[in-house]
């Protein structure tokens, strides 16, 4: 025998209180699917949350993230905070990174500047919180003659104290 | 893609009048329709709506006055009971999408309906 | 039931200038308003739906602002066509009283 509900199409329901009928689901509510007994409630889209695609009889209310914020999860089940180059999200929100690391993106971790010396090299241009520092020649290029260039003051680097 | 309005006559005050709205080019499964009032001289009325899956709803203040009903081409308006109130103009228009939430953005040129004895 | 306060109930102005329509609603209503202008023995024009958002073809003089129960449409720029009555209308579906169609009183806009 079949089933009168699955006449039902999508956007009704299978209504038991009136002898198993086809009833239109009432507006905020919605069925994406035939012969389903009850309609779903529309996602709400506030807060954080903003509205990409309006709910409807047939299909549910789709959200994104306000400005300063990005989707997590499936179906954009939460907002996380963008943060700022030079910061870096923590349990308490967006934190400015600490002296000798940086972030040059909206997400992501701070980073240790780069050790120039490790390389042999000097700091031709001091780091800050959004650039990293950046390496030049190392002091034994740079003997008198080499260049007319004198090399900015070396940057305090991570794990190095000043020589 | 258009709405129009027709039905609208004199009548005399408690006989019942439908009006009908054909609409060509789109589905009424797709959008939804609304009926809004204008009498002479005065703002826009909303009376009512029927949704893409059927579902009619009716604004507070109708308390039974109108009943909107819906074909696969035609949505009807009638005034069960008219009274010199419901002289005015009267408008179908289409929704801009099919969502809950939505905008009108194709209307129809109106009929005029006179109540008088 | 959602209520649609607007002023002014009328509003001169001159060519060249600008006119603010305000439209308040009784509950918030998010963005979900639309602004419409209709001249007489003519149906109404949608002009912006979304509470900002230009419908296709009309003239970026108008525009739109607002969210939550204060709006207001702004036209610059005043041109002789543009004397007309403006309506607000909420498209907020689903209010606690699920009565989201109401319109604004309306404000005739006469350009000198």
């Known amino acids: 025998l079949q089933d009168p509900c699955s006449n039902c199409p999508a956007g009704t329901f299978c209504d038991n209180n009136r002898n198993q009928i086809c009833s239109p689901c009432p507006p905020n509510s919605f069925s994406s699917a035939g012969g389903q007994r009850t309609c779903d409630i529309c996602r709400q889209c506030k807060g954080v949350f903003r509205t990409r695609k309006e709910c409807s009889s047939t299909s549910n209310a789709e959200c994104d993230c306000v400005p300063g914020f990005r989707c997590l999860g499936a179906g954009c089940a939460m907002c996380e905070e963008y943060c700022q180059q030079g910061q870096e999200l923590t349990q308490k929100g967006c934190k400015d990174c600490c002296f000798g690391t940086f972030n040059d993106q909206k997400r992501g971790i701070c980073r240790p500047w780069t050790n120039c010396s490790l390389d042999g090299k000097s700091v031709l241009v001091n780091g800050t919180k959004e650039r990293d520092v950046v390496c030049g020649p190392s002091p034994a290029d740079l003997s008198p003659g080499a260049s007319s260039v004198t090399p900015p003051a070396p940057a305090r680097e991570p794990g190095h104290s000043p020589q | 893609q258009s709405v129009e309005e027709s039905g609208g006559r004199l009548v005399t005050p408690g006989t019942p009048l439908t009006l009908t709205c054909t609409v060509s080019?789109?589905?009424?499964?797709?959008?939804?329709m609304i009926w809004v009032r204008q009498a002479p001289g005065k703002g826009l009325e909303w009376i009512g709506v029927?949704?893409?899956?059927?579902y009619i709803s009716h604004a507070t203040w109708v308390k039974g006055r109108f009943t909107i009903s819906k074909t696969s081409t035609t949505v009807g308006l009638e005034i069960t009971s008219p009274t010199t109130e419901d002289t005015a103009t009267y408008f179908c228009?289409?929704?801009?999408?099919?969502?809950?939430?939505?905008?009108?953005?194709?209307w129809g040129q109106g009929t005029l309906v006179t109540v008088s004895s | 039931d959602i209520v649609m306060t607007q002023t002014p109930a009328s509003v001169e102005a001159a060519v060249g200038g600008t006119v603010t329509i305000k439209c308040q609603a009784s509950?918030?209503?998010?963005?979900?308003l639309a602004w419409y202008q209709q001249k007489p023995g003519q149906p109404p024009k949608l002009l912006i739906y979304?509470?900002?958002t230009l419908a296709s073809g009309v003239s970026s003089r108008f525009k739109g602002s607002g969210s939550g129960t204060e709006f207001t449409l702004t036209i610059s720029d005043l041109e002789s066509a543009d004397a007309a009555t403006y309506y607000c209308?909420?498209?907020?579906?689903?209010?606690?009283?699920?009565?989201?169609?109401?319109f604004g009183g309306g404000t005739e806009v006469v350009v000198k």
């Open positions: 228009a289409r929704s801009a999408d099919g969502s809950w939430s939505t905008y009108f953005n194709l």
């Open positions: 509950e918030s209503i998010s963005n979900y």
């Open positions: 209308q909420t498209n907020y579906c689903c209010s606690s009283s699920d009565n989201g169609f109401a």
């Open positions: 029927v949704y893409d899956n059927g």
């Open positions: 979304k509470a900002s």
């Open positions: 080019g789109f589905s009424l499964s797709t959008y939804a």
